[in-house]
Interface confidence: medium
């Protein structure tokens, strides 16, 4: 399936890239899913799009949902979906998981945190730092191009780390902000906030009516065996041994995996002969460890029996 | 100041069944991960089981699977253990003790005084 | 399970001598060690976490160190209110204790 998540905040400048690649000189065609409606290409409007590119010049909650894009060539035509999340903004400091890129790490050797998305932007330096939304002050910081450099990483840098910019659009400046985890490796093995690798945040399964469906919890730790960290699964906030449904078992045996040297789990739920209202449940994979709790949710969709998908 | 409290310990018949709580205060229950660790008399120190903040996930020796449950309850700041198929080798002071958080593993940093299960016919 | 054997199992000492504990671990452990006094009929206290950090109110004269699978706990100038049992644990999987250092008055 040729589909991407974007997310952005409301009141930002949010820009996507079509998930189907082609060659600069092919047009790109841009509709919103739900009503087959073209999007504009004048730059006039809030959202037009622009080649391979679709702008939120700023972004509204109102403009969640799926868009398509289609490639078109001379000989073939390719199509793509991104799924679009506006989210409003936070009163708080606390920035939620699913507003976060993905984690990245860092030693004594390599301490550059890329600031996301970013090469989608006209922007122009310097970009602004902030970790756990206090700007961030010293001479151990420095912000080089598109990403930021922490000289001496230790332990205590680990956190989530903002980078803040402004795009330019035709004389327009537009604020935007991306936040991502910044983990410190310790070659002596350690134990981060644990990081859900599937499923994506929010994904949307399809399942057939009648049939089995696996669904897989996957989630690292840091290095090392880790004690006291699991992944399992939840049905609408309930434990599935409390939930009380025989055909959606969890599968035990949460034996540990090392990838890269990561410490990481595996939880597979099984759905038997899957039912009209298994559709209508949320399903949570958890990962927990003493540093805390990240929760990823699934849906299940029916999926049609023929796909027309170009 | 942190306090842990075990009560429950006593004497129980091999097979009996036998449940400790350990009443928290001084600090967000709901915040650590909390565990069991016990002592038989004369011996070293054992773990025997931890729980999550919320009690999602539960974790327990080899020596107590499938005889032990632990369980909390936030709303009343408790922690319990219940014992069953109890064994003369499960004779220990039985200590709730508090797991710190942070990236350098599972330290148990306060612990309760203790509460002595003796299983004896 | 991962085994943490102490050495010595017992060791006499006086008020003034530094004293070394060790712990060797079976398999690599990273930094995932523990230490902790116990004084008889009392609990364990948390002495030394993540191999060398010290809690706030553990006096300066005890210090950790090591990585891997030894690991070493000193106390720079044994005091009165030393005299005691020592543990290490592991973290880095089930924890597992070792069998405990007695620290007598010579």
């Known amino acids: 399936k040729f589909s991407k998540q974007s997310w952005g905040l409301e009141n930002e400048a949010l820009i996507v890239r079509c998930p189907r690649q082609g060659k600069p000189s092919y047009t790109v065609d841009w509709y919103y899913s739900q009503t087959n409606k073209s999007i504009p290409t004048q730059e006039r409007n809030r959202v037009f799009a622009s080649g391979q590119l679709l702008k939120f010049l700023p972004a509204a909650v109102a403009d969640s949902g799926i868009y398509t894009c289609i490639v078109r060539s001379p000989t073939f035509n390719r199509t793509g979906y991104a799924n679009v999340t506006i989210y409003k903004k936070q009163s708080d400091c606390n920035v939620p998981d699913y507003l976060m890129y993905s984690t990245v790490s860092g030693s004594e050797k390599n301490s550059k945190i890329y600031c996301p998305t970013i090469d989608l932007y006209n922007w122009t330096a310097p970009l602004e730092w902030f970790k756990n939304c206090q700007a961030l002050q010293g001479s151990r910081y420095r912000a080089h191009k598109s990403f930021l450099v922490i000289d001496n990483v230790m332990t205590e840098d680990a956190g989530d780390y903002t980078c803040k910019f402004i795009h330019n659009e035709n004389g327009a400046n537009y604020s935007v902000t991306a936040t991502r985890s910044f983990t410190v490796k310790d070659e002596q093995g350690f134990s981060l906030f644990p990081v859900i690798g599937a499923p994506a945040q929010n994904e949307i399964k399809e399942v057939e009516i009648g049939k089995n469906a696996n669904l897989t919890c996957s989630a690292c730790f840091g290095k090392g065996t880790q004690f006291l960290a699991a992944v399992l699964w939840q049905l609408n906030g309930t434990k599935i041994t409390d939930f009380g449904e025989p055909r959606i078992q969890q599968e035990e045996g949460q034996n540990q995996s090392f990838s890269n040297g990561l410490a990481c789990l595996d939880m597979v739920l099984r759905i038997a002969d899957v039912k009209e209202e298994d559709l209508l449940l949320q399903y949570d994979c958890l990962a927990l460890n003493l540093h805390g709790l990240r929760r990823h949710t699934v849906r299940l969709s029916r999926k049609n029996p023929i796909d027309h998908h170009s | 100041e942190v306090q842990l409290l075990e009560s429950g310990g006593g004497l129980v018949q091999p097979g009996g069944s036998l449940r400790l709580s350990c009443a928290a205060s001084?600090?967000?229950?709901?915040?650590?991960?909390m565990s069991w660790v016990r002592q038989a008399p004369g011996k070293g120190l054992e773990w025997v089981s931890a729980?999550?903040?919320?009690?999602?996930?539960?974790y327990y020796a080899d020596s107590v699977k499938g005889r032990f449950t632990i369980s909390r309850d936030n709303s009343k700041n408790t922690l319990y253990l219940q014992m069953n198929s109890l064994r003369a080798e499960d004779t220990a002071v039985y200590y709730c003790?508090?797991?710190?958080?942070?990236?350098?593993?599972?330290?148990?940093?306060?612990w309760g005084q203790g509460t002595l299960v003796t299983v004896s016919s | 399970d991962i085994q943490m054997t102490q050495s010595p199992s017992s060791l006499s000492a006086s008020v003034g001598d530094r004293v070394t504990i060790t712990c060797k671990a079976s398999?690599?452990?990273?930094?995932?060690l523990t230490w902790y006094q116990q004084k008889p009929g009392k609990a364990p206290k948390l002495l030394i976490y993540?191999?060398?950090k010290r809690p706030s109110g553990v006096p300066s004269r005890f210090s950790g160190s090591g990585s891997g699978t030894d690991f070493t706990l000193t106390i720079s100038s044994l005091q009165p209110e030393d005299f005691a049992t020592y543990y290490c644990?592991?973290?880095?999987?089930?924890?597992?204790f070792g069998q405990g250092t007695k620290v007598e008055i010579k």
């Open positions: 003790a508090r797991i710190r958080v942070g990236p350098s593993g599972g330290a148990f940093d306060y």
């Open positions: 001084g600090f967000t229950f709901s915040s650590y991960f």
């Open positions: 729980i999550s903040r919320e009690g999602r996930a539960t």
């Open positions: 398999d690599h452990i990273g930094k995932f």
């Open positions: 993540g191999r060398n």
């Open positions: 644990q592991q973290s880095y999987s089930t924890p597992t």
